[in-house]
C-alpha cells in the first residue's frame, strides 16, 4: 500500500520526523536509507536502513502494586528489505520479563473512631453548613491503608436571619455597532453600549444598596478606516527543480497575493501561497558500510611454541569483523578490521577456585510462555594467577595489557552437592500477557 | 525514442525452464522500475511482479513466487523474466512494461510495453 | 488481494456516440494523505501491447486524445469516449497500483453498431 514518507528516523523514541509526503510506496521512500516510513499516521514507523534490533522499552508497571508481581519489556526489529539477527521479520517484538515489587507489604484497612460534636453553622444570616469530624484510629490502618467513607461530614443549618442584598452591575453589553463602517460619512458615527444593575438586583426586605453609577455610556466612533479591498491570487508559479541528486524530494509552486493587493484592511487571500509535491530522482542513495560486531577471539598461540596454556608466558590472538552493508558507492567502513591483543592462555587449566555470593535475579523465563521462572546462581569462580599485567615484547615500544584468556578448569569444596554451579529457581507471580502496544493503540 | 524490445517466441517441453529478455532504449534504464505482465490467449492481464534496476529490489505476486525470477543488467540495459518448471498453463504472451515517471514526479502506472514474448509449452 | 471487477464485459456504440466503461474495486484506491486514486487505464487492440490512457484515474497520458476522459474515486471509476471513433474498437483494461499485487479488470470488448 503507499505510505507516509519521513526523512528522518528517531532511534531514541523509535518515531518518524519530518514528513515528506503520503502516497509513495517502500520502495522509493526507502531509496534513502535515511529515511523512514509509516503505512498509516500514527502507526508504527519503520526506518529505512538494513533491519535491526531497537532499543529495549522501559519496563511496563509493574503487575501488582504490592507484594512480588511481574513487568514486561520489549524490542522490535525495525528497518526495511531484511531480516534481524536470529532470522527475524521486521516488525516482529522480543519480550523480557522480571519480579518486580513496587511495595513489599499490602495495604490494610482502619476503623472509626466515633463522630465529634458538630461544629458551629459557616453563616450568621440566611442558610449554611455545619461539619463534624472523626479519626481514622480505631484501629489505625497499615502499609499506607486508609478507613473507608470520609472523615468528616456536613449538613444544612438555618440562622433564620434574612441576609440583605446589595445591588452589583452585570458586565457591560457590546458597543452597538457604529452607523457608518468607513469613514466620510454625512454623521457623525456614535456607539453606545449599557449595563443592568442585575448581579445582583438589591433587596427589597432587608433594603440593599443601589448599584454605583451610570447604566449606559456614548462614545464617538473614531478611526475607522477607508473601505477595504479583498486580496486575489495571481498565477501559480513554475515548479522548482528536485532539491536533491537522490530519493525523494519536495519541489514547491508558489503564488503571489497580488490580483489585486488587499487595500485597507481588506481580508488577504484564503488558501496557500505555495503547494508542495514530491518528487522522485528514482536514483538510490548511497550506503555506508557498518561494522559487524567482533568475531570471537582466536586461541592465545606464541608462534614456535606448542602450547602456552597454564604458563606465564604471554601470547598474541587476535579477532575480526566484516564491513557489511555497503552499496550504492557509500563510504567504507573507517577503523580497523582485526583487533590483536597480548594474553595468557588459561585455557583448561586447573585453578583454586571460590563461591561467589549470590547473582541478581535473573530474567523470568519463557516471558510469554507458560509457568515462568527465575534463578540466580553461585559460581565456582577461579583465581587468577599472579601474572604480570604488561609486559614489554619488542625493545623500545613500551608495556603492553595482557589479558587472560580461556576457561580454566575452578577447583572449589562442595556446596550443596555441586561442585561448579549451585542455582536456586523460583516461579514469577502475576505475570502479564504479551501484546503488541501497536494493536493496542488501533 | 522509449522503447522496449522483446526476445522472440519459444517453443518448450513441459518441466524445462525459458529465459526472456527486455531490453531499454531511449531512457536511464536505472530510473525506472521494469514490470512483467502475463497475457494467456484470449484471456486478460495478470501482473507478475517488478524488478528496479537500480537497486535490484523485486517484488512478485504470490502467485508466481518460485515459478518467476527477475533479473536485471545495467550495463546492457536489459531485464530478464526466467520461468521455471513448466506447465501448459504457462502458455501466454508475457510482456515487459516500463513504470512510468515524468518530470521526477512519482507514478506507478505502466507507460511503455515490449511487443511480448510469447510461449508455448507442449510436449 | 484487490479485485477490480468491470462492466459491461462488452459494449457495442455508434460512431459518434459516448460509450461509458465502468471499473469497481474491492477496496478504496484513494490514499487519503495526498487524495489520489491509484487507478489507470490501459487500450489494448488485437495484436499490440496495451498502451496506457489515463493514469490518477483522471490525469490524460500525453498524446491521448480528449474524447478520453476517466472520473470516480474510491471505489467507483468511469472510463468515457465522448464520440467513439473507429479506431477506438479495442479491449479496454482498469488496474489498480494501491496495493501489491497489482491487480487489473478482466476488460471490456469495445465494438462499433
Known amino acids: 500500500d503507499p505510505v507516509l514518507c519521513f526523512t528522518q528516523y528517531e532511534e531514541s523514541s523509535g518515531k518518524c520526523k519530518g514528513l515528506l509526503g503520503g502516497g509513495v510506496s517502500v520502495e522509493d521512500c526507502c531509496l534513502n536509507t535515511a529515511f523512514a516510513y509509516q503505512k498509516r499516521s500514527g502507526g508504527l514507523c519503520q526506518p529505512c536502513r538494513s533491519p535491526r534490533w531497537s532499543l529495549w522499552s522501559t519496563w511496563a508497571p509493574c503487575s501488582v502494586t504490592c507484594s512480588e508481581g511481574s513487568q514486561l519489556r520489549y524490542r522490535r526489529c525495525v528497518g526495511w528489505n531484511g531480516q534481524c539477527s536470529g532470522k527475524v521479520a521486521p516488525g516482529t517484538l522480543e519480550w523480557q520479563l522480571q519480579a518486580c515489587e513496587d511495595q513489599q507489604c499490602c495495604p490494610e484497612m482502619g476503623g472509626w473512631s466515633g463522630w465529634g460534636p458538630w461544629e458551629p453553622c459557616s453563616v450568621t444570616c440566611s442558610k449554611g453548613t455545619r461539619t463534624r469530624r472523626r479519626a481514622c484510629n480505631h484501629p489505625a490502618p497499615k502499609c499506607g491503608g486508609h478507613c473507608p467513607g470520609q472523615a468528616q461530614e456536613s449538613e444544612a443549618c438555618d440562622t433564620q436571619q434574612v441576609c440583605p442584598t446589595h445591588g452589583a452591575w452585570a458586565t457591560w453589553g457590546p458597543w452597538t455597532p457604529c452607523s457608518a463602517s468607513c469613514h466620510g460619512g454625512p454623521h457623525e458615527p456614535k456607539e453606545t453600549r449599557s449595563r443592568k444593575c442585575s448581579a445582583p438586583e438589591p433587596s427589597q426586605k432587608p433594603p440593599g444598596k443601589p448599584c454605583p453609577g451610570l447604566a449606559y455610556e456614548q462614545r464617538r466612533c473614531t478611526g475607522l478606516p477607508p473601505c477595504p479591498v479583498a486580496g486575489g491570487w495571481g498565477p501559480w508559479g513554475p515548479v522548482s527543480p528536485c532539491p536533491v541528486t537522490c530519493g525523494l524530494g519536495q519541489t514547491m509552486e508558489q503564488r503571489t497575493c497580488n490580483h489585486p493587493v488587499p487595500q485597507h484592511g481588506g481580508p488577504f487571500c484564503a488558501g496557500d501561497a505555495t503547494r508542495t509535491h514530491i518528487c522522485n530522482t528514482a536514483v538510490p542513495c548511497p550506503v555506508d558500510g557498518e561494522w559487524d560486531s567482533w568475531g570471537e577471539w582466536s586461541p592465545c598461540i606464541r608462534r614456535n611454541m606448542k602450547s602456552i596454556s597454564c604458563q606465564e608466558i604471554p601470547g598474541q590472538q587476535s579477532r575480526g569483523r566484516t564491513c557489511r552493508g555497503r552499496k550504492f558507492d557509500g563510504h567504507r567502513c573507517a577503523g580497523q578490521q582485526q583487533d590483536i591483543r597480548h594474553c595468557y592462555s588459561i585455557q583448561h587449566c586447573p585453578l583454586k577456585g571460590s563461591w561467589s555470593e549470590w547473582s541478581t535475579w535473573g530474567l523470568c523465563m519463557p516471558p510469554c510462555g507458560p509457568n515462568p521462572t527465575r534463578a540466580r546462581q553461585r559460581l565456582c569462580t577461579p583465581l587468577l594467577p599472579k601474572y604480570p599485567p604488561t609486559v614489554s615484547m619488542v625493545e623500545g615500544q613500551g608495556e603492553k595489557n595482557v589479558t587472560f584468556w580461556g576457561r580454566p578448569l575452578p577447583r572449589c569444596e562442595e556446596l550443596q552437592g555441586q561442585k561448579l554451579v549451585v542455582e536456586e529457581k523460583r516461579p514469577c507471580l502475576h505475570v502479564p500477557a504479551c501484546k503488541d502496544p501497536e494493536e493496542e493503540e488501533l | 525514442e522509449v522503447q522496449l524490445q522483446q526476445s522472440g517466441p519459444e517453443l518448450v517441453k513441459p518441466g524445462a525452464s525459458v529465459k526472456m529478455s527486455c531490453k531499454a532504449s531511449g531512457y536511464t534504464f536505472a530510473h525506472n522500475w521494469i514490470h512483467w505482465v502475463k497475457q494467456k490467449p484470449g484471456q486478460g492481464l495478470e501482473w507478475i511482479g517488478y524488478?528496479?534496476?537500480?537497486?535490484?529490489?523485486?517484488e512478485y505476486s504470490q502467485r508466481f513466487k518460485g515459478k518467476a525470477t527477475l533479473t536485471s543488467d545495467k550495463s546492457s540495459s536489459t531485464a530478464y523474466m526466467e520461468l521455471s518448471s513448466l506447465t501448459s498453463e504457462d502458455s501466454a504472451v508475457y510482456y515487459c512494461?516500463?513504470?512510468?515517471?515524468?518530470?521526477?514526479?512519482?507514478?506507478?502506472?505502466?507507460?511503455?510495453w515490449g511487443q511480448g514474448t510469447l510461449v508455448t509449452v507442449s510436449a | 488481494d484487490i479485485v477490480m471487477t468491470q462492466s459491461p464485459d462488452s459494449l457495442a456504440v455508434s460512431l459518434g456516440e459516448r460509450a461509458t466503461i465502468n471499473c469497481k474495486s474491492s477496496?478504496?484506491?484513494?490514499?487519503?494523505?495526498?487524495?489520489?486514486?491509484?487507478l489507470a487505464w490501459y487500450q489494448q487492440k488485437p495484436g499490440q501491447p496495451p498502451k496506457l490512457l489515463i493514469y490518477w484515474a483522471s490525469t490524460r497520458e500525453s498524446g491521448v486524445p480528449d474524447r478520453f476522459s476517466g472520473s470516480g474515486s474510491g471505489t467507483d471509476f468511469t472510463l468515457t469516449i465522448s464520440s467513439l471513433q473507429a479506431e477506438d474498437v479495442a479491449v479496454y483494461y482498469c488496474?489498480?497500483?494501491?496495493?501489491?499485487?497489482?491487480?487489473f479488470g478482466g476488460g471490456t470488448k469495445l465494438e462499433i453498431k
Open positions: 524488478i528496479n534496476p537500480g537497486t535490484d529490489y523485486t
Open positions: 477496496q478504496s484506491l484513494l490514499y487519503s494523505s495526498n487524495q489520489k486514486n491509484y
Open positions: 512494461a516500463r513504470r512510468k515517471l515524468y518530470g521526477n514526479f512519482v507514478d506507478y502506472a505502466m507507460d511503455y
Open positions: 488496474q489498480q497500483y494501491y496495493s501489491y499485487p497489482y491487480t
